[in-house]
């Protein structure tokens, strides 16, 4: 058993059939020795007497809020938690696989430049009794300070029968040193409740690895005279890291018919813009990269040919 | 060329190559041998390689004030990297693939750490690490590792220089 | 499997350019890098350049810089070899070859002859 | 560029024969260096990789050794099949290149 949080406990359980459980001792916060009962959420029933409550927390109906009382007054709460292990392996019930980059992928973030400032989330199909927290760090054995705000739900879709409640966090590390190379990973931990059931999920990873830049942005076209050639150019996106002379992107322009069978034309630049064949019913669609590091490239930003 | 002594290299050369090393350490990485890395843990047989860190002048403003310190600093992480390549570590079984191209980096980890230091001139070096893994296994672990750091540094440096081309140039 | 399979056979007259096709198919095209290689009647083999399709970062044989530029169509895993500018000794049979080390996958050559 | 030498340019040989055929280059190369077989018609055929590696499907009667340098290709006992060309060709750096062919024919 440990402290999540003041008088929040986890109780850490190997699950199976006929497991023996955690024998457990609360002690009521209170000077008090004598007249003391204790009893569980809203029930009444007395659970026990005394300063200590020893009980065997076997299963969820053993967790809860356990209260201690003297002559009708509440001295002190202790709400107790489960965390699951089954065949060693912790619980992720409240989480959903998000299955990208590979399967196990609970947390994903996303960062738009080398500022140290990033962005992480995580789906669930709950909808209700669910509380989300936050921790990040840079490195584990000696920690560096990243500060996480509070959790909120940023998206809701339906995805078949049921909902999905998208939450994020954004976070930034507190001495950010952009034009360094990272050689130790940034932590993020995230601990979550619902109803009485405790899971934590982790993630870590190098900024630089889930770079992301923003779409590029002024997207224009110009024809060229006497020519179906047009010059096609954008600008760095306002988020990007600066200056552009030190962080680079690089850019791939698409030329793309309406039917998704059609040839699709791909040129590469480093330059911010381009010439390419403007064909009848096309879109011209940019998007950008890191230049010297392979992270993820950007959305598309897209015009119609016409 | 950057000599200790400190005149200026030839910035728009070692971009080009720099950018050119980017590429490389990319594409080499699939080709070392096939493993899912992340079950690993990282940093205990990488954290003896050269890392530019925040005090080396690597950024816009240090590279302002004196570029020396930077290109030191990548200079003897190139020389490590391009050792390690030299190595067993490399040239031991598991045979690296034959479509790799490893040999490309490996030249051109050298090219470039000559054109920051010409013949006769010598800064510091780092002393490379005995990285002798016995077992191929671990042997195909390190050359992951390795590369995957590589791409961080190269990555790095090729900013440098793709500034100090912009700005530093004469 | 891997196979390279490449365009056919052109007969082009001296000034003109010529664009060789080589389909890849059995591996994820943009992970290796591409390379032309090409041999002339009787001769050895000649390194042209090479491609990753990837970045579409590509280098060149001095003595073809400005003639030559290879590209490729990730979505059709075709990479293409254009020869501008064509002479008589650019008569040969040009190779695609997978990797940027050694070459274990081959196409199967495309003969390109340049006579007046 | 790095110049590669191929010696002997040709050479006759019977079945059962030991054959070497030598590869210097201008420079250091490290052990990057392959060996190639192509016969008439066809396109090359990878031998030996990494100066040493035997490529996959290649009969065990190939060898590759050296470093740096100088390299050699050994075919322990020749096979009516291994009348052909053979090439080295580097694969430190580019450009790549390639020697200048030995051609192997029967006495």
């Known amino acids: 058993i440990w402290e999540l949080k003041k008088d929040v406990y986890v109780v850490e359980l190997d699950w199976y059939p006929d497991a023996p459980g955690e024998m457990v001792v609360l002690t009521c916060d209170t000077p008090e020795e004598d007249g003391i009962t204790w009893t569980l959420d809203q029930s009444s029933e007395v659970l026990g007497s005394g300063k200590t409550l020893t009980i065997q927390v076997k299963e969820f109906g053993d967790a809860g809020q356990y209260t201690c009382h003297k002559g009708g007054e509440v001295l002190s709460h202790s709400l107790l938690l489960l965390h699951k292990k089954e065949d060693g392996i912790w619980s992720t019930d409240i989480l959903k696989d998000q299955k990208e980059p590979k399967n196990k992928t609970f947390l994903r973030c996303e960062a738009k430049n080398y500022s140290g400032r990033f962005t992480c989330w995580w789906l669930t199909t709950i909808s209700t009794d669910l509380t989300f927290s936050v921790k990040s760090s840079r490195g584990s054995s000696d920690p560096q300070g990243v500060t996480c705000g509070a959790a909120t739900l940023s998206a809701e879709r339906v995805r078949g029968d049921n909902k999905e409640y998208e939450y994020s966090v954004e976070c930034q590390e507190d001495s950010a040193c952009p034009a360094a190379e990272e050689s130790l990973p940034i932590e993020v931990m995230v601990d979550a409740v619902h109803k009485l059931k405790y899971e934590n999920y982790t993630s870590s990873f190098f900024i630089r690895d889930i770079i992301k830049p923003d779409p590029p942005k002024n997207l224009q076209l110009k024809p060229l005279k006497n020519s179906r050639q047009v010059e096609v150019s954008w600008e760095y996106p306002d988020t990007w890291s600066t200056p552009h002379s030190y962080f680079s992107l690089t850019f791939c322009v698409q030329v793309q018919g309406k039917s998704k069978r059609e040839k699709k034309d791909r040129v590469f630049t480093d330059k911010t813009s381009a010439t390419v064949i403007c064909r009848k019913n096309a879109s011209i669609s940019v998007r950008a990269q890191d230049r010297y590091y392979s992270s993820s490239w950007s959305e598309w930003a897209s015009v119609p040919c016409s | 060329r950057a000599v200790p002594g400190g005149s200026s290299p030839a910035w728009t050369q070692c971009q080009q190559l720099s950018q050119k090393l980017c590429t490389l350490a990319w594409s080499a990485h699939p080709l070392v041998g096939h493993m899912d890395l992340r079950e690993e843990g990282d940093e205990e047989t990488t954290n003896d390689v050269p890392h530019i860190q925040c005090g080396d002048g690597c950024d816009p403003q240090g590279l302002r004030d004196n570029s020396q310190f930077c290109l030191q600093r990548i200079h003897q992480g190139l020389i490590f990297y391009e050792k390690l390549l030299g190595s067993d570590i490399f040239t031991g079984e598991p045979s690296l693939l034959p479509d790799s191209p490893v040999g490309q980096l490996h030249a051109s980890l050298l090219g470039l750490s000559q054109l920051l230091q010409p013949e006769g001139h010598h800064w510091e070096t780092q002393q490379i690490p005995s990285l002798s893994p016995s077992q191929p296994w671990q042997r195909l672990l390190l050359r992951f590792k390795i590369l995957r750091s590589l791409q961080a540094f190269v990555a790095v440096a090729a900013r440098v220089f793709a500034h100090g081309a912009a700005t530093l140039s004469p | 499997q891997v196979q390279l399979v490449q365009s056919g056979a052109e007969v082009k007259k001296p000034g003109a350019s010529v664009k060789v096709s080589c389909k890849a198919s059995?591996?994820?095209?943009?992970?290796?890098?591409m390379t032309w290689v090409r041999q002339a009647p009787g001769q050895g083999l000649e390194w042209m350049g090479q491609i990753f399709p990837a970045s579409g970062s590509a280098d060149y044989a001095q003595k073809l810089q400005g003639r030559v530029t290879m590209t490729t169509d990730t979505s059709t895993s075709t990479a293409y070899m254009e020869l501008r500018s064509l002479r008589s000794d650019d008569t040969a049979v040009y190779y695609c070859?997978?990797?940027?080390?050694?070459?274990?996958?081959w196409g199967q050559g495309t003969l390109v002859t340049v006579s007046s | 560029d790095i110049q590669m030498t191929q010696s002997p340019s040709s050479l006759s040989a019977s079945v059962g024969d030991r054959v070497t055929i030598t590869c210097r280059t201008s420079e250091n190369i490290y052990s990057y260096l392959a060996w190639y077989q192509q016969k008439p018609g066809k396109a090359p055929k990878l031998l030996i990789y990494n100066a040493k590696t035997l490529a996959e499907g290649v009969p065990s009667r190939f060898s590759g050794s050296g470093s740096g340098t100088d390299f050699t290709l050994t075919i322990s006992s020749l096979q009516p099949e291994d009348f052909a060309t053979y090439y080295c060709?580097?694969?430190?750096?580019?450009?790549?290149?390639f020697g200048q062919g030995t051609k192997v024919e029967i006495k």
């Open positions: 070859a997978r990797g940027g080390g050694g070459f274990a996958y």
């Open positions: 060709q580097h694969h430190y750096g580019i450009p790549f290149t």
């Open positions: 059995g591996y994820i095209f943009i992970t290796y890098w």
